[in-house]
């Protein structure tokens, strides 16, 4: 994995220490030849939780185009999920305009949908380079 990235189960992870909107975080990861993190299992969830710190953190899951989709094409319906109770709820009461179309880890690791423009921390994920 690149310097300052962490390895887990054949993937490399980078944990931000500041905040960006979901689109900006998505763009950042792509420029690093990576994508916002996709959570495939309880074990991967625990790894991410352990390293991210107890703050809201964007992941690569959004329903901006309709149904919930992972940014790498992983099937949402059959895949791992870890939503907080009563989430996602597409809440409109925040006053920022629109609903809630982007998913993030909350303090305890469970997921919530929120307004995509909130500047939260984020996690990038990339496949490990087999040559390293």
């Amino acid at each position: 994995c690149p310097v300052n990235w962490l390895e887990y189960e054949g993937s490399c992870y980078w944990f931000s220490r500041s905040g960006k909107s979901w689109p900006e975080a998505d763009k950042y990861c792509q420029l690093e030849s990576a994508h916002l993190v996709v959570v495939n299992s309880r074990e991967e969830q625990k790894f991410i939780q352990h390293h991210m710190g107890p703050v809201n953190t964007w992941m690569g899951l959004t329903d901006q185009s309709g149904p919930w989709k992972w940014v790498d094409g992983t099937d949402y319906e059959t895949g791992f999920k870890n939503w907080r109770p009563e989430q996602p709820d597409d809440w409109y009461g925040h006053g920022l305009g629109g609903g809630e179309d982007c998913a993030h880890f909350t303090d305890d690791g469970r997921w919530n949908d929120d307004v995509c423009q909130r500047p939260y921390r984020w996690v990038c994920e990339a496949a490990r380079d087999p040559a390293t």
């Epitope: 500041s18 009461g93 919530n112 500047p119």
Partner: antibody, heavy 121, light 112 residues
């Protein structure tokens, strides 16, 4: 240490314009959301506006929407509030305030000392 | 907009005695992320407000432990276990779950 210093306050006639500035130091200004909050003489606190760390999003209280514009110059570590079509009810001390964290926190941890704006003919 | 209602609006306290301020919101302040976006500020005479408590019950750095916050949903309380002379000023609750951020009317605390 975090320092926020407002300037540009003064007496202005109704209908005229005024621009407030807030010079920031002691932290990485470009990483933080910033707000303006005002307090009319002898009254309570009223949130006025917020601007995202990179200036990409701005939101306003209904009472100032369409008349006030919040902006920032990250190269100068400065926050601005352009106030136009001023009314007597805009008379207040205007505080600039910084988000608590360099990610969404939802509250202000640091405040300036305030700039008094008096709208009077 | 969310309306924040504080009671009482004024409080006169003997030094060393406890004080309690109530704050009620017109809507729940519990967010989908599990946090409750309720804050307490103190504005001392001639000064800008200063943060005391964030997210209902967390003391901001440097805030004495005689200050404590509690509550959930729409009902919140700020308690001062033993009031000191330096605690005089106006206390405000604030919500930030919804734009616009809104404050309570303020509670003036004075020393008897």
């Amino acid at each position: 240490q975090v320092q926020l210093v407002e300037s540009g306050g003064g007496v202005v006639q109704p209908g005229r314009s005024l621009r407030l500035s807030c010079a920031a130091s002691g932290f990485t200004f470009s990483s933080y959301g910033m707000h303006w909050v005002r307090q009319a003489p002898g009254k309570g606190l009223e949130w006025v506006a917020i601007i995202w760390y990179d200036g990409s999003y701005k939101y306003y209280a209904d009472s100032v929407k369409g008349r006030f514009t919040i902006s920032r110059d990250n190269s100068k570590n400065t926050l601005y509030l352009q106030m136009s079509s001023l009314r007597a009810e805009d008379t207040a001390v205007y505080y600039c305030a910084r988000d608590a964290h360099d990610f969404w926190s939802g509250y202000f941890a640091y405040w300036g000392q305030g700039a008094l704006v008096t709208v009077s003919s | 907009d969310i309306v924040m209602t504080q009671t009482p609006l004024s409080l006169s306290v003997t030094p060393g005695q406890p004080a309690s301020i109530s704050c009620k919101s017109s809507q729940s302040l519990l967010h989908g992320d599990g946090k409750t976006y309720l804050y307490w500020y103190l504005q001392k005479p001639g000064q800008p407000p200063q943060l005391l408590i964030y997210e209902v019950s967390n003391r901001f750095s440097g805030v004495p432990d005689r200050f404590s916050g509690s509550g959930s949903g729409t009902d919140f309380t700020l308690k001062i276990s033993r009031v000191e002379a330096e605690d005089v000023g106006i206390y405000y609750c604030m919500q930030s779950i919804q734009i616009p951020w809104t404050f309570g009317q303020g509670t003036r605390v004075e020393i008897k």
